[in-house]
Amino acid sequence: SPSGVRLVGGLHRCEGRVEVEQKGQWGTVCDDGWDIKDVAVLCRELGCGAASGTPSGILYEPPAEKEQKVLIQSVSCTGTEDTLAQCEQEEVYDCSHDEDAGASCENPESSFSPVPEGVRLADGPGHCKGRVEVKHQNQWYTVCQTGWSLRAAKVVCRQLGCGRAVLTQKRCNKHAYGRKPIWLSQMSCSGREATLQDCPSGPWGKNTCNHDEDTWVECEDPFDLRLVGGDNLCSGRLEVLHKGVWGSVCDDNWGEKEDQVVCKQLGCGKSLSPSFRDRKCYGPGVGRIWLDNVRCSGEEQSLEQCQHRFWGFHDCTHQEDVAVICSG
């Protein structure tokens, strides 16, 4: 699931035990404070209509695997968020699967069809910018700009886990024209849908569009990074971008492998393995501390692929901000 959340064990996809994805693993949510506002957001994220109840997750068979972790202690939504990830969350304190949260939504299935099997942004720099393509019956199709809107772009960005839509109606450059069949036009999204397939549209394959009308979308990359305070772009205190806000990274567990991934991602050569004293010369940051306990193997192409605690969860001060010095 691109949204990293699902309901398991119900009679249909819109009810069941709540499961969320973290670092490629699916786990449950503790029912500590779980209420109808949280379910409302979850139902919206899944394209399942309105919330109808907060049943205990233990009601749904089969029960959670013993090895499966409870990942979140509490979710606190106001009810207006688009996704559960936008709600306040606390990492787990103490919770067993007897306390798993459940949810049921009113609308079990979207009435719209066809149902494509995926969406991607192609020929862009990274997976969060590019030409909109949808997959249907193992074939990728482009999407015509006719009827495309900011609301549709918001859905795509959300579906891809790419944050908010930044650029929504740019035509493709000639080199980025699609060579695939044109899937559909007249996308009529409300902006609340969990996936593009939940939006009504004109019949697929029946349109008068050309590839110079292919839709290009750019989303805020959820995981940008930079080095600040140094003499050049390849040295300084590390900051990462999340929810449109730059924040620092705590040095707990930080080492050579993490340095190498940052230098690689920035195109800054290799890490110069700076001393503790050299790292401290960039001073402490201010504002958010976004990441803690980052663990890389060194093979990753992006810090995004490394393990870390939930965004914003740390036990650090800015005196522990990471700095990195690359060869340039």
Epitope: K69, V70, L71, V92, Y93, D94, S96, I289, H314
Partner: antibody, heavy 114, light 112 residues
Framework: QSVEESGGRLVTPGTPLTLTCTVS????????INWVRQAPGEGLEWIGM?????NTYYANWAKGRFTISRDSTTVDLKITSPTTEDTATYFC???????????WGQGTLVTISS | ELDLTQTPASVSAAVGGTVTISCQSS????????LSWYQQKAGQPPKLLIY???TLASGVPSRFKGSGSGTQFTLTISGVQCDDAATYYC????????????FGGGTEVVVK
């Protein structure tokens, strides 16, 4: 369900000491364990905890002085460099102020003296 | 630094009387009500009386009552019994980019 502390003894200042909390009937992958101490004639003092997801949290005063770790049935508290002020009865316990459960051991006495 | 201040440090009450203990937190506890009250007698571990600020733990007599929210909490013992002579502690759970617990300094209840 029960928890039991062990490892308390007389040690000289600066000698690292590890206390062990042995749990039974508790799945540590689902439950958090706290360490609390009580100096003679004094009140209860929270040291820190290890959560069900294996994250550790410490009181500000305890950071760097104590380390909490666990395996499948035990939770250890290491006093890295004890001083005479660390003389106390040390309890391990499962509690969470919003929930009805509360499970405490009988405590183990640690005496730091030269 | 989180701080739970309990008052008074010591209180004396006659059998059948009422004891009120206050607990003030330097910041709001988790979800405004994650505060519990414990009773401890000499040589024993603490015993849970009240959790979630006002909910009576199993097997605890109804003469114990908890109230309050946010940063200000109260434990009231009505119709004090001889067996209530003990030290009472408030305990709060907090969340701020991580979990924390704290105990109040304790209140000794002497029954005359």
């Amino acid at each position: 369900q029960s928890v039991e502390e062990s490892g308390g003894r007389l040690v000289t200042p600066g000698t690292p000491l590890t206390l062990t909390c042995t749990v039974s009937g508790i799945d540590l992958s689902s439950y958090a364990i706290n360490w609390v101490r009580q100096a003679p004639g004094e009140g209860l003092e929270w040291i820190g905890m290890i959560s069900s997801s294996d994250n550790t949290y410490y009181a500000n005063w305890a950071k760097g002085r104590f380390t909490i770790s666990r395996d499948s049935t035990t939770v250890d508290l290491k006093i890295t460099s004890p001083t005479t002020e660390d003389t106390a009865t040390y309890f391990c316990a499962r509690f969470y102020a919003g929930r009805s459960y509360s499970l405490w051991g009988q405590g183990t006495l640690v005496t730091i003296s030269s | 630094e989180l701080d739970l201040t309990q008052t008074p440090a010591s209180v004396s009450a006659a059998v059948g009387g009422t004891v009120t203990i206050s607990c003030q937190s330097s910041e709001s506890v988790y979800k405004s009500n994650y505060l519990s009250w414990y009773q401890q007698k000499a040589g024993q571990p603490p015993k849970l009386l009240i959790y979630a600020a006002a909910t009576l733990a199993s097997g605890v007599p109804s003469r114990f009552k908890g109230s309050g929210s946010g940063t200000q909490f109260t434990l009231t013992i009505s119709g004090v019994q001889c067996d209530d002579a003990a030290t009472y502690y408030c305990q709060g759970t907090y969340y701020s980019s991580g979990w924390y617990n704290a105990f109040g300094g304790g209140t000794e209840v002497v029954v005359k």
